[in-house]
């Protein structure tokens, strides 16, 4: 007859995964709190410090590639200009336009202006007196 095996003392044994510490834990299991709070965006400024782009909708993927000759002779910073006002940043759907436009079309808005009819091309100090 085998001797009875004494019951092990378990009072100092910790669960491997610390389950006793987590005894009172209530898993969220999907308990999601949605806060429907209106954000005050009235003081948000665009990178250029203007509100020009306030109605801008990011294309989130629509890229427009336009094949146009580019006149770089009068390139200025995007900030402080309206040059970028119609830009749609994007990333995926690609629309390729093979539109042939010459340099005249690029500078069409300047043709006939006082600056255009007084200053020679590439002329230095431009000043309307």
């Amino acid at each position: 007859q085998t001797a009875p095996v004494p019951m092990p003392d378990l009072k100092n044994v910790k669960s491997k995964i610390g389950s006793t510490e987590n005894l009172k834990h209530q898993p969220g299991g999907g308990k999601v709190q949605i806060i429907n709070k209106k954000l005050d965006l009235s003081n948000v400024q665009s990178k250029c410090g203007s509100k020009d782009n306030i109605k801008h909708v990011p294309g989130g993927g629509s890229v427009q590639i336009v094949y146009k000759p580019v006149d770089l002779s009068k390139v200025t910073s995007k900030c402080g200009s309206l040059g970028n006002i119609h830009h749609k940043p994007g990333g995926g759907q690609v629309e390729v336009k093979s539109e042939k436009l010459d340099f005249k079309d690029r500078v069409q808005s300047k043709i006939g202006s006082l600056d255009n009819i007084t200053h020679v091309p590439g002329g230095g100090n431009k000043k309307i007196e």
């Epitope: 202006s113 009819i117 200053h119």
Partner: antibody, heavy 112, light 106 residues
Framework: QVQLQQPGTELVKPGASVKLSCKAS????????MHWVKQRPGQGLEWIGN????????NYNEKFKSKATLTVDKSSSTAYMQLSSLTSEDSAVYYC?????WGQGTTLTVSS | ENVLTQSPAIMSASPGEKVTMTCSAS?????MHWFQQESSTSPKLWIY???KLASGVPGRFSGSGSGNSYSLTISSMEAEDVATYYC?????????FGGGTKLEIK
């Protein structure tokens, strides 16, 4: 200050040629187109042509192509307009202009 | 050639009266410029780039228009405004002037 100096009057005979001058001062001469304009007595203004003083490039009103020749002398900042085969129809005031500034005009009289 | 037609050719206005003159182009232009010429003097640039006043031009003058139809307006006529006004285009060669509007005072 910007000035465009033109001789007041020129009297020439029919069939002859004349070279009108326009001396510019007070600004960088080669930076600006020089235009020439004709005005007959009691009439309106007619654009003759212009010249780029940097390289001598010219544009002419077709009407004046065989009549006027535009040139410049960069060293003296002077623009010239030569008029050939003169007739009474060429009697007029001729202005050189930078558009924002105008010369006083040269009164050309073609008479025998 | 882009023909500029000004109307009326001659007009007169009383002091304080509003004055409008027009310039019609046979082809569209990007900008219209206006010159004032008082009798027996050289023309002066008066309005440039359609609506900008040249240096020293009184604020009662204004310019407007687009395409092939442009106008110069004086909000309240003054005696010193008596002159001939010419429109001018530089949008295509040859550059051209209108025939002028002679403004007189009543």
């Amino acid at each position: 200050q910007v000035q465009l100096q033109q001789p007041g009057t020129e009297l020439v005979k029919p069939g002859a040629s004349v070279k009108l001058s326009c001396k510019a001062s007070g600004y960088p001469f080669t930076n600006y187109w020089m235009h020439w304009v004709k005005q007959r007595p009691g009439q309106g203004l007619e654009w003759i042509g212009n010249i780029n003083p940097t390289n001598g490039d010219t544009n002419y009103n077709e009407k004046f192509k065989s009549k006027a020749t535009l040139t410049v002398d960069k060293s003296s900042s002077t623009a010239y307009m030569q008029l050939s085969s003169l007739t009474s129809e060429d009697s007029a005031v001729y202005y050189c202009t930078r558009v924002t500034y105008w010369g006083q005009g040269t009164t050309l009289t073609v008479s025998s | 050639e882009n023909v500029l037609t000004q109307s009326p050719a001659i007009m007169s206005a009383s002091p304080g009266e509003k004055v409008t003159m027009t310039c019609s182009a046979s082809s569209n232009v990007n900008y219209m410029h206006w010159f004032q010429q008082e009798s027996s003097t050289s023309p002066k640039l008066w309005i440039y780039d359609t609506s900008k006043l040249a240096s020293g031009v009184p604020g009662r003058f204004s310019g407007s228009g687009s395409g092939n139809s442009y106008s110069l307006t004086i909000s309240s006529m003054e005696a010193e405004d008596v002159a001939t006004y010419y429109c001018f285009q530089g949008s295509g060669y040859p550059y051209t002037f209108g025939g002028g509007t002679k403004l007189e005072i009543k």
